[in-house]
């Protein structure tokens, strides 16, 4: 191999290069100088660098490093941000459809309960949305409030329609009776169980995605230490001081430097791997009562069944409540029982015709597969950055931080570095405080994800099975049904593929959300253009 070319006798090349970094030439010597004031690019002989230039190189090196890190994480960051937004919107659409289904059920079967029922339904689904988004909401509370509010209206409108307005004073007694007499049977408890399980999982899923974004944002905007800045300067710029403008750093040397610079970041790796695997476990368990799409879209049916339960026991209930709430009423009113409210409209509400098999669950699985390709993201970062910055192939005729070498030797390079700074010391410092914080957050979410994840192979939740809550389940075959089985209920083939927006025709004139919520928004359709087309179920 030919010996390295002698340094530029006039520093001309160095001057022209440096001018691109820093307009003006006042810091660049015209000819090589001893460079005794240099602290990073320690010269073996005359040098074309000054202390000011060295400082500028350090700043530029750290900025370069930040940009490399940001470009390295760009694809992963976009993947999580996009999916977090898509899932959040999708969950909101599910909630809105569930609300519309429930309102339609009241409109079709119990018109005398509207608009009060619409109000209670609206309140319930508002709480569902707030819970998913992380608000301090208690699921049992929201279910209790729904049934507490519904029963007085059912009693005064369906069971005792002769009651005058003044009898509204018995509302409080009726709210109490609702729980004491278990007027809705086990239905409120069933809904509590299903809703809390499915929403808990949904909420943690969204929380986990949002934390994923926070992790990437944190490592994306790391400020590298001065020690790292010196290492990077030595690797990328010190060769220029010797006039070696075209020389590239040795690949092995780059890896050593990057591992030193990113020692703290790489500590995230263990927890990042666990995060992706725990998220995968959670997603694998998101079916049946752990799938909010399945649970919420079937709620209208369970609520309908609960009202039928009250109606079946109306005679007995009216007598008991008449005695219980007698002090609230001046006199007893006749218990009228109107068949049109008792029997469900025989026209079966036709279900969506599914053209594509894509659902939220397949979208979730797709996300996990993509995330798994980034499972080694943090451990692979040093190597990734070296492969995306100029390094000499095969470690031949390359820069080792001090000189141009024919072949890179890690041992020699380390010995040469000893006087300049201690690489081992840099590694021992531990992660930055922000990295430690994000590791703590990852540990916390991983723990939550683990506690949420169901044991593999479990078909039914043990507690539910014991209490017989899922007896109406239609099994694990392709034709799953949601909720109850009364006439007029929606049978669902492979769950409702509500994506893209169901075209509603609820014909709910006085319903809150009549035309507004019945009409799909264009942007929702475009968001889910590839997630399946569905025809209107509620004609």
């Amino acid at each position: 191999q030919p010996p390295p070319p002698p340094p530029d006798a006039t520093c001309h090349q160095v001057r022209s290069f440096f001018q691109r970094l820093q307009p003006g030439l006042k810091w660049v010597p015209e000819t090589p100088v001893p460079g005794s004031d240099l602290q990073v690019c320690l010269p073996k002989g005359p040098t074309c660098c000054s202390r000011k230039m060295e400082e500028k190189y350090q700043l530029t090196a750290r900025l370069n490093m930040e940009q490399l890190l940001q470009s390295a994480s760009m694809e992963l960051k976009f993947l999580i941000i996009q999916n977090a937004a898509v899932f959040q919107e999708a969950f909101e659409i599910v909630v809105r459809h569930a609300k519309n289904y429930t309102n339609a059920m009241f409109k079709n079967n119990y018109p005398s309960l509207t608009p009060q029922a619409f109000e209670f339904v609206g309140e319930f689904f508002t709480d569902v949305s707030l819970y998913i988004l992380g608000s301090d909401i208690n699921v049992d509370d929201m279910v209790n409030e729904l049934f507490d509010s519904l029963f007085p209206v059912i009693y005064t409108q369906l069971m005792n329609p002769g009651l005058p307005d003044s009898a509204l004073d018995i509302n409080e007694c009726l709210r109490g009776a609702r729980r004491d007499l278990k007027v809705f049977g086990n239905f409120p408890k069933l809904i509590m169980t299903q809703v809390s399980k499915s929403l808990q999982v949904t909420r943690i899923f969204l929380q986990a995605l949002n934390l994923g974004i926070e992790v990437i944002n944190t490592t994306d905007h790391l400020k590298f230490s001065k020690d790292c800045g010196r290492m990077l300067t030595r690797m990328w710029y010190c060769s220029y001081c010797q006039g070696l403008m075209m020389v590239k750093p040795c690949g092995g040397y780059c890896n050593v430097v990057m591992q030193g610079c990113m020692a703290g970041v790489v500590e995230i790796d263990k927890y990042w791997r666990e995060y992706i695997l725990s998220l995968e476990e959670l997603v694998n368990g998101m079916y049946r009562i752990y799938d909010m799409e399945n649970v919420l879209l079937g709620l209208f049916s369970t609520i309908h069944d609960s009202i039928q339960y009250v109606q079946k026991n109306a005679g007995k209930l009216t007598t008991t409540i008449g005695k219980l709430c007698a002090h609230s009423q001046q006199r007893q009113y006749r218990s009228a029982y109107y068949p049109e409210d008792l029997f469900i409209d025989k026209k079966v509400l036709k279900v969506a015709h599914v053209e594509h098999e894509e659902t939220l669950s397949s979208r979730r699985r797709e996300l996990i597969q993509k995330l798994k390709s980034f499972i080694s993201f943090y451990s692979a970062l040093p190597g990734y950055i070296c492969s995306h910055s100029p390094v000499a192939e095969n470690d031949t005729l390359c820069w080792n931080g001090q000189e141009l070498v024919e072949r890179y030797s890690q041992k020699a390079a380390r010995n040469g570095m000893k006087n300049q700074f201690n690489l081992h010391e840099l590694k021992m410092k531990g992660p930055e405080p922000v990295v430690s914080q994000i590791i703590d957050k990852l540990k916390h979410i991983n723990q939550l994800l683990r506690t949420m994840s169901m044991p593999k192979g479990r078909v039914l939740d043990k507690n539910l099975d014991e209490e017989g809550f899922e007896s109406g389940d239609c099994g694990d075959d392709e034709d799953e049904c949601i909720g109850g089985s009364g006439d007029g209920m929606i049978k669902v083939k492979n769950q409702l593929r509500f994506l893209a927006e169901l075209a509603y025709d609820l014909d709910v004139d006085d319903a809150p959300g009549n035309s507004q919520q019945a009409t799909p928004k264009d942007n929702e359709i475009s968001t889910f253009h590839n997630l399946g087309n569905v025809h209107s179920p509620l004609k």
């Epitope: 609206g122 309140e123 508002t126 909401i137 208690n138 049992d140 929201m142 507004q516």
Partner: antibody, heavy 116, light 110 residues
Framework: EVQLLESGGGLVQPGGSLRLSCAAS????????MSWVRQAPGKGLEWVSA????????YYADSVKGRFTISRDNSKNTLYLQMNSLRAEDTAVYYC?????????WGQGTMVTVSS | QSVLTQPPSASGTPGQRVTISCSGG????????VNWYQQLPGTAPKLLIY???QRPSGVPDRFSGSKSGTSASLAISGLQSEDEADYYC???????????FGGGTKLTVL
């Protein structure tokens, strides 16, 4: 007869704290969600916060989130509003009201003045 | 700035019929029921109408409410001097996840 009686208002400096109370009677307190609604002098009504019957669910207006905390003691039939980091714009009459989406009974209100 | 829009003032002579309007959008009035409150000078508000058109016991049937699309209105027939007060419409806002009020209408009985 339903009665709601607020107390705890007064003059406080910006950045200071106050705790409002609302004593309820005439209904089964634990069965109902309760709210705080305020009215700045000469202005309209603004919902501030709500809490479910059991106290398990809490709701806040964006303007007070992170500064105010609603709570209740069902054994004492009392609703509370802990107000921290008070600002001049929090100056208002604070009403305690029964309900969450609509308010069928209101207290007479307690005046909170935030001024240096 | 209130989410719901009400005229700042309205007036009428005793015995007359007065209507107060309340205008909103698809995420508030369009999706939820409307309530009306009456606030007599120097007193706390009082529920006047709930669920668009329901009157609590004790509220005279001179007061009636209605809702259509994204608007609501309160009608007072046979206006009386004791009806002089501020009237507020209110509903739930699905976007803000909270109850919202109109700016209030000051009713003067001439």
């Amino acid at each position: 007869e339903v009665q709601l009686l607020e107390s705890g208002g007064g003059l406080v400096q910006p950045g200071g704290s106050l705790r409002l109370s609302c004593a309820a009677s005439g209904f089964t307190f634990s069965s109902y969600a309760m709210s705080w609604v305020r009215q700045a002098p000469g202005k309209g009504l603004e919902w501030v916060s709500a809490i479910s019957g059991s106290g398990g669910s809490t709701y806040y207006a964006d303007s007070v989130k992170g500064r105010f905390t609603i709570s209740r003691d069902n054994s004492k039939n009392t609703l509370y509003l802990q107000m921290n980091s008070l600002r001049a714009e929090d100056t208002a009459v604070y009403y305690c009201a029964k309900g969450k989406r609509y308010f069928d009974y209101w207290g007479q209100g307690t005046m909170v003045t935030v001024s240096s | 700035q209130s989410v719901l829009t009400q005229p700042p003032s309205a007036s009428g002579t005793p015995g007359q019929r007065v209507t107060i309007s309340c205008s909103g959008g698809s995420s508030d009035i369009g999706s939820n029921t409307v309530n009306w409150y009456q606030q007599l000078p120097g007193t706390a508000p009082k529920l006047l109408i709930y669920y668009n058109n329901q009157r609590p016991s004790g509220v005279p049937d001179r007061f009636s409410g209605s809702k259509s699309g994204t608007s609501a209105s309160l009608a007072i027939s046979g206006l009386q001097s004791e009806d002089e007060a501020d009237y507020y419409c209110a509903t739930w806002d699905d976007r803000m996840y909270s109850p919202v009020f109109g700016g209030g209408t000051k009713l003067t009985v001439l």
